[in-house]
């Protein structure tokens, strides 16, 4: 039986990261031991599982590595990886400094909102979520048909605004769609905008009906794709 | 019609100040980003500041900052820009610019109308 | 700052004749929403500028269709297929992805 140790220390000399926001960071902390240890991360001593992150985090245990992509000034902190096994356990600090960008137009994480499909009756959730440096607001709009028309005659499609308030706010970038039916299918956009300009990503809700075979033959209530 | 109309420039000595504004009509005032633009004479254009449609965020030029300082009123749909310290290189037309909106962009997302400009000459 | 670099600094043209000018970004103006915030501006004698073209390639309302803007990422060209009278003024393209927004030196078209 071994504690745990570092495999490739040379690797992990650099302990002070300064990247620019919108990089993407990769810490490793390689190491051996027996048993084999398992690795965590913490972030400022805490726990990281990354779920308030945008974007994630991607943990590649067999690589002993935590990803970070797109880092946003609130990714600033000591990362801690933390190695054991039942003989013994090291871990190792990273620093993280994020380097402000110019602000810029807003990016919303790209496969988001997502293509939907769901059942009548069903709820349903889309996301969007948003980076923006400049403070953003933000507006769920739904694509809708006006005489037969999508778009008007000067080309822009009609749309309805069905939520609107500042990021800041309480579930703002999270659309619900309560018990819906088949006229809540169709294109929805999240737009963001803040002092630079806007940008916005779209996403297709299917409805389908209750009685459908095939639907009910995939377990799931509701079921989301790229 | 949209429209956007400035005024305030003049001649002023290196080190005092001056105030512009910039009066809007035709649109929702605010809804919409501003910017300034300037222009020194028979020279390029250059971008001086932004504020959001509900003043809550400002940015600079780095060649301003801590200079000039932008504002709105959208109670009298007015922009504003502060001129502190001035410089003989300050000398230009400047140009209130309509930035992005709030919703759906009908067409480009701001900068798309310009006012006629107001001339401001730094000079000893 | 992302630096707009066009060419040529002046054009003169043969009315009837095609024209067209180049735009080179230091960095790139492709969006994370798939759009290429770079716009065209012409600046005709004593007036402010107008726009022509608005993310890469669509033009303004009322702008004749003579005018197209093409390209990608850092690299872009606004295209006059036959130049008139009227086109004469200062040409920019301008950045619109981040502050500080920026603009090219301007090239001027001129009718021969």
């Known amino acids: 039986q071994q504690a745990p140790y570092w495999t490739h220390p040379q690797r992990m000399e650099k302990k002070l990261h300064a990247v620019p926001a919108g990089n993407t960071v990769k810490f490793r902390c390689p190491a051996a031991g027996n048993p084999t240890p398992t690795i965590r991360w913490l972030k400022d001593g805490q726990a990281f599982h990354g779920e308030n992150r945008i974007g994630g985090i991607r943990l590649r245990h067999q690589h002993w590595s935590l990803v970070m992509e797109s880092v946003v000034p609130s990714d600033r902190g000591t990362y801690t990886c933390l190695v054991e096994n039942a003989v013994g356990s090291i871990r190792y600090n990273y620093l993280l400094d994020v380097l402000e960008r110019s602000p810029h137009r807003p990016i919303l994480q790209a496969g988001l909102p997502a293509n939907t499909t769901a059942v009548v009756g069903s709820d349903v959730e889309l996301l969007c979520k948003v980076y923006s440096d400049a403070q953003p607001h933000i507006q769920w709009l739904k694509h809708i048909v006006i005489n037969g028309s999508s778009f008007g005659a000067d080309g822009f499609p009609y749309v309805q605004v069905l939520k609107t308030a500042d990021i800041n706010s309480s579930e703002v970038e999270v659309l619900y769609l309560r018990n819906v039916s088949a006229e809540d299918a169709g294109e929805y956009t999240c737009l963001a905008g803040n002092s630079i300009g806007l940008s916005y990503q779209s996403a297709w809700l299917t409805v389908l009906p209750e009685e459908d075979p095939t639907w009910t033959a995939a377990a799931p209530e509701a079921r989301y794709t790229d | 019609e949209v429209q956007l109309l400035e005024s305030g420039g003049g001649v002023v000595q290196p080190g005092r100040s001056l105030r512009l504004s910039c009066a809007a009509s035709g649109f929702t005032f605010s809804s919409y980003a501003m910017h300034w633009v300037r222009q020194a004479p028979g020279k390029g254009l250059e971008w001086v500041a932004v504020i959001s449609y509900d003043g809550s965020n400002k940015y600079y030029a780095d060649s301003v900052k801590g200079r000039f300082t932008i504002s709105r009123d959208n109670s009298k749909n007015t922009l504003s820009l502060q001129m502190n310290s001035l410089r003989v290189e300050d000398t230009a037309i400047y140009y209130c610019v309509r930035g992005a909106g709030l919703g759906w962009p009908y067409g480009p997302d701001g900068f798309d109308i310009w006012g006629q400009g107001t001339m401001v000459t730094v000079s000893s | 700052d992302i630096v707009m670099t066009q060419t040529p600094l002046s054009l003169s043209v043969t009315p009837g004749q095609p024209a067209s000018i180049s735009c080179k970004s230091s960095?790139?103006?492709?969006?994370?929403?798939?759009?290429?915030?770079v716009y065209w501006y012409v600046q005709k004698s004593g007036q402010p500028p107008q726009l022509l073209i608005y993310e890469l390639s669509n033009r303004f309302s009322g702008v004749p269709d003579r005018f197209s803007g093409s390209g990608s990422r850092t690299d872009f060209t606004l295209k006059i297929s036959r130049v008139e009278a009227e086109d004469v003024g200062v040409y920019y393209c301008?950045?619109?992805?981040?502050?500080?927004?920026?603009f090219g030196g301007g090239t001027k078209v001129e009718i021969k």
């Open positions: 301008m950045q619109y992805i981040e502050a500080p927004l920026t």
């Open positions: 960095r790139s103006l492709l969006h994370s929403d798939g759009k290429t915030y």
